[in-house]
Amino acid sequence: DAEFGHDSGFEVRHQKLVFFAEDVGSNKGAIIGLMVGGVV
C-alpha cells in the first residue's frame, strides 16, 4: 500500500519503499525554508 505525504521522497518502512509524492494542492511547508501563505 502506497502512503502519500507532502514531501517528495522515499522512506524505508519495514523494508518497504514508500513514495511521498509532493502534494501541490497543500501549503503545509514541505519545502525547507519556503515561505508558505501569510502570517498565521
Epitope: H6, D7, E11, K28, G29, I31, G37
Partner: antibody, heavy 112, light 111 residues
C-alpha cells in the same frame, strides 16, 4: 515580529538525553511542518526529519530514526527535538524551520 | 541515499562580475511529473541558511533575480550575476526527491 526562538546552548554528558525546543512567536506553529536540521560544522547540513504539528505525523531520515524524536506541544506553540544516547558525534548546531522561518540554532556540546 | 557533490570553494570572483557554483547529484532529480527536485540555499556568516531557489528554477520570495539556476537531471549550476559583498557565504545544493540530502557546500570567495 514573527520568529522561531530556539532554546539556549546545551552541555550534556555522553549517554544522556537532551530535549531542544523551538517556539513560535507571532506565528501559529500548528499550521506548517516543522523541519529539524543538524549542522556539524559551518559546511555540512543534515536533515533529521519533520513533524506535522496538526496530527503529530513524523518522517525521519533513517540515520536519525533511533536517535531523534520529534514532538509538538500546540498549547505552548513549541516544537521539540529529543536526542538520546548522546555521543561526541551528536555535538552540532541544530536548527528548526517552519514555512520560511528559521530558528537561530541551538549549539549542543557533548562532553564529560 | 542520493549524494549531492559540490566543490568546497569557488573560484574567487571580483565584485560586480558573475560567479557560478556547481552541484552534481548521484541520481537524476527529474521526476516523471516534470519537476526537478533541486534546491539552493545560502548561509551567510553567523546566520541560519536561507532558501534561494526551489525546484531547480524558482526564485524564493525576496531573493534578487541576480540569482539563476539551471541544469539537467544530475548536473546543476547556480549563477550569480553582478556579485555583491552581501552574497558572501556558503552555498548548498539539496534534493528532496528521496527525503532531503545536502551537498557539502561551496564557499563563495571575493578577490
Amino acid at each position: 515580529e514573527v520568529q522561531l526562538q530556539q532554546s539556549g546552548a546545551e552541555l550534556v554528558e555522553p549517554g544522556a538525553s537532551v530535549k531542544l525546543s523551538c517556539t513560535g512567536s507571532g506565528f501559529n506553529i500548528k499550521v506548517y511542518y516543522v523541519h529539524w536540521l543538524k549542522q556539524l560544522t559551518e559546511q555540512g547540513l543534515e536533515w533529521i526529519g519533520r513533524i506535522d504539528p496538526e496530527n503529530g505525523e513524523t518522517i525521519y531520515t533513517p540515520k536519525f530514526q533511533d536517535k531523534a524524536t520529534l514532538t509538538v506541544d500546540t498549547s505552548s506553540n513549541t516544537a521539540y527535538l529529543q536526542l538520546s544516547s548522546l555521543t561526541s558525534e551528536d555535538a552540532a548546531v541544530y536548527y528548526c524551520v517552519s514555512s520560511g522561518y528559521w530558528g537561530q540554532g541551538t549549539t549542543l556540546t557533548v562532553s564529560s | 541515499d542520493i549524494v549531492m557533490t559540490q566543490s568546497a570553494f569557488s573560484n574567487p570572483v571580483t565584485l560586480g562580475t558573475s560567479a557560478s557554483i556547481s552541484c552534481r547529484s548521484s541520481k537524476s532529480l527529474l521526476h516523471r511529473n516534470g519537476i526537478t527536485y533541486l534546491y539552493w540555499y545560502l548561509q551567510k556568516p553567523g546566520q541560519p541558511p536561507q532558501l534561494l531557489i526551489y525546484q531547480m528554477s524558482n526564485l524564493a520570495s525576496g531573493v534578487p533575480d541576480r540569482f539563476t539556476s539551471s541544469g539537467s537531471g544530475t548536473d546543476f549550476t547556480l549563477k550569480i550575476s553582478r556579485v555583491e559583498a552581501e552574497d558572501v557565504g556558503v552555498y548548498y545544493c539539496a534534493q528532496n526527491l528521496e527525503l532531503w540530502t545536502f551537498g557539502g557546500g561551496t564557499k563563495l570567495e571575493i578577490k
